[in-house]
């Protein structure tokens, strides 16, 4: 179906968990576009009024970023062109847990997907041989 004269595109996310104090990844992929300048990535968090992160015209656009994410977010800029909109979240905090939306605009259309992000003090399971 059409959205503002464009089609919807497929956006895929994967629920994940982050270790407090470490860096985490919020995974998101989309149907790639041939022109980086036509791609807009917005990450939003439920209940947070500023943006988590925005990437447009080939670079970060953080003027509307919420202060709780200041200096802690990055996309993999060199991988956006191949459809990777995943977000790196530095120094994960307990309050980072919640529902995130990965919203994508390309020349092909728009799409979004939600993901649940859990935070905690997780440890790698020990494997005894």
């Amino acid at each position: 179906f059409g959205i503002s004269g464009r089609h919807s595109i497929t956006v895929t996310t994967v629920a994940s968990a982050g270790n407090i104090g470490e860096d985490g990844i919020l995974s998101c992929t989309f149907e790639p576009d041939i022109k980086l300048s036509d791609i807009v990535i917005q990450w939003l968090k439920e209940g947070v009024l500023g943006l988590v992160h925005e990437f447009k015209e080939g670079k970060d656009e953080l003027s509307e970023q919420d202060e709780m994410f200041r200096g802690r977010t990055a996309v993999f800029a060199d991988q956006v062109i191949v459809g990777n909109a995943s977000l790196r979240l530095k120094n994960v905090q307990l309050t980072d847990a919640g529902t995130y939306k990965c919203y994508i605009i390309t020349s092909k259309g728009k799409g979004n997907a939600n993901l649940e992000y859990k935070t905690g003090a997780f440890s790698m399971p020990e494997v005894n041989v």
């Epitope: 209940g47 009024l49 500023g50 953080l62 003027s63 509307e64 970023q65 919420d66 202060e67 200041r70």
Partner: antibody, heavy 116, light 107 residues
């Protein structure tokens, strides 16, 4: 157009409390934070804190912690700022302002005079 | 808290003059700075946000620049209605502190 309309001037005695309202119109009330800023006579602007109209979560300036309370009523698109244990140095014009990282627009201001 | 040091605190200028007001942050705030104009008895009005972006409806004679810790508001050619007090504000980290203000007066 986006508008913030504040309640009228107040005169209070030291030790009393005051509650100032700020009614928003012309936009989605829950889409942006509401901030409070005050200005003592002839002085500069002082950030007091903010409220998230969606969740009711607040952040207050440290020097006002324990005396200031910000609340909201989503049914009337109104935020409130209550300041207790008033002293003479709280005499100021109190402004509400909408925003995320910049404030626009601002309410017209509410003069609160604390005098015995 | 992040301190914002604004200078000068007052300034006398004439219509047509080019005027520059500076603001220095006590730490790196990237481009999270805003500029407001306030006239006596009125609420502040947003002029510039995100260091250099002109708010809708604000005349193009106003401009902002800078990044990191040092920022500038410039009025390219002063008009009679520009005589007012100007404030910078950082929005990098709460509390979103203001500079102490610059009063722009007619010479």
């Amino acid at each position: 157009q986006v508008q913030l309309v504040q309640s009228g001037a107040e005169v209070k005695k030291p030790g009393a409390s005051v509650k100032v309202s700020c009614k928003a119109s012309g936009y989605t009330f829950t889409a942006q934070y509401m901030y409070w800023v005050r200005q003592a006579p002839g002085q500069g602007l002082e950030w007091m804190g903010r409220i998230n109209p969606t969740s009711g979560n607040t952040v207050y300036a440290q020097k006002l912690q324990g005396r200031v309370t910000m609340t909201r009523d989503t049914s009337t698109s109104t935020v409130y700022m209550e300041l207790s244990s008033l002293r003479s140095e709280d005499t100021a014009v109190y402004y509400c302002a909408r925003g995320i990282n910049w404030f626009d627009p601002w309410g017209q201001g509410t003069l609160v005079t604390v005098s015995s | 808290d992040i301190q914002m040091t604004q200078s000068p605190s007052s300034l006398s200028a004439s219509v047509g003059d080019r005027v520059t007001i500076t603001c220095q942050a006590s730490q790196d705030i990237s481009n999270y700075i805003n500029w407001y104009q306030q006239k006596p008895g009125k609420a502040p009005k947003l002029l510039i946000y995100a260091a250099s972006r002109l708010q809708s409806g604000v005349p193009s004679r106003f401009s902002g620049s800078g990044s990191g810790t040092d920022f500038t508001l410039t009025i390219s050619s002063l008009q009679p209605e520009d005589f007012a007090t100007y404030y910078c504000q950082q929005s990098y980290r709460s509390p979103f502190t203001f500079g102490q203000g610059t009063k722009l007066e007619i010479k």
